[in-house]
């Protein structure tokens, strides 16, 4: 199977990897942040 | 036609940083992936890194972290690699390859006194 | 790192023989988007290497069917079914599933 000249990127997912890794990362902060103001209105 | 043009051979001294550039056309540059590979002793292949045009968004093999650092231009569709401070470890061929697939044809950096 | 074993080193071979050349990974390849990024290129002398399959088994635009790629996991053969002048070189196996991307130290097909 031939692949067409340019679809072809054999490390794209790569990228993509990274991309998602610091979402999530972004995200845990994010809910330690939320985490640490409920804390404080709490109090 | 995809085509990645290399900059030219540099005789450089230790010590010294210089940037090697990769002007690609047949496709539209900002859709894939920049590879960068180091070629020494005429065989021994060590990927560099990659850099997505689009995004600026980088990958390094951290054995080069703070010895290589790719951008891009996105005007005139060119990926650099600049390669700092310089040694006889870092004499080798140097290619960008897009999406890992389509290779330049290799820039020979070399290092002396 | 994932190391990449490949094996022969050296393959010498005579024109119309078929080739066989095997690449071993440290660590299994399989993408955990169920790809498995393993490629061969091909280097010969004084060019840039060219890239002749993709993901095990995918022959690259242009590449002949002589050529033939197979495997899974940690375990890859790279098949040239009868060898033409134009095949010698160095044949590289390399993986783009895990960072760093990494490649086998080369296998030279010369004639015998």
């Known amino acids: 199977s031939e692949e067409p000249p340019i679809s072809l990127d054999l490390t794209f997912h790569l990228l993509r990897e990274v991309l998602e890794m610091a979402r999530a990362e972004q995200l845990a902060q994010q809910a330690h942040s939320n985490r640490k103001l409920m804390e404080i209105i709490g109090k | 036609e995809v085509q990645l043009q290399q900059s030219g051979p540099e005789l450089v001294k230790p010590g010294v940083s210089m940037k090697i550039s990769c002007k690609a056309s047949?496709?539209?540059?900002?859709?894939?992936?920049m590879n960068w590979v180091k070629q020494s002793h005429g065989k021994n292949l060590e990927w560099i890194g990659l850099?997505?045009?689009?995004?600026?968004?980088?990958i390094y093999n951290q054995k080069f972290k703070g010895k290589a650092t790719l951008t891009v231009h996105k005007s005139s569709s060119t990926a650099y690699m600049e390669l700092l401070s310089l040694t006889s470890e870092d004499s080798a061929v140097y290619y960008c390859?897009?999406?890992?697939?389509?290779w330049g044809q290799g820039t020979l950096v070399t290092v002396s006194a | 790192d994932v190391v990449m074993t490949q094996t022969p080193l050296s393959l010498p071979v005579s024109l119309g023989d078929q080739a066989s050349i095997s690449c071993r990974s440290s660590?299994?390849?399989?993408?955990?988007?169920?790809?498995?990024?393993l490629h061969w290129y091909l280097q010969k002398p004084g060019q840039s290497p060219e890239l002749l399959i993709y993901?095990?088994?995918n022959r690259f635009s242009g590449v002949p069917d002589r050529f033939s790629g197979s495997g899974s996991g940690t375990d890859f053969t790279l098949k040239i079914s009868r060898v033409e002048a134009e095949d010698l070189g160095v044949y590289f196996c390399s993986q783009s599933t895990h960072v760093p991307l990494t490649f086998g130290a080369g296998t030279k097909l010369e004639l015998k």
């Open positions: 390859a897009n999406g890992f697939a389509y």
């Open positions: 993901k095990v088994s």
């Open positions: 850099i997505h045009p689009d995004n600026g968004g980088t």
């Open positions: 660590q299994s390849l399989l993408h955990s988007n169920g790809n498995t990024y």
């Open positions: 047949g496709y539209s540059f900002t859709d894939s992936t």
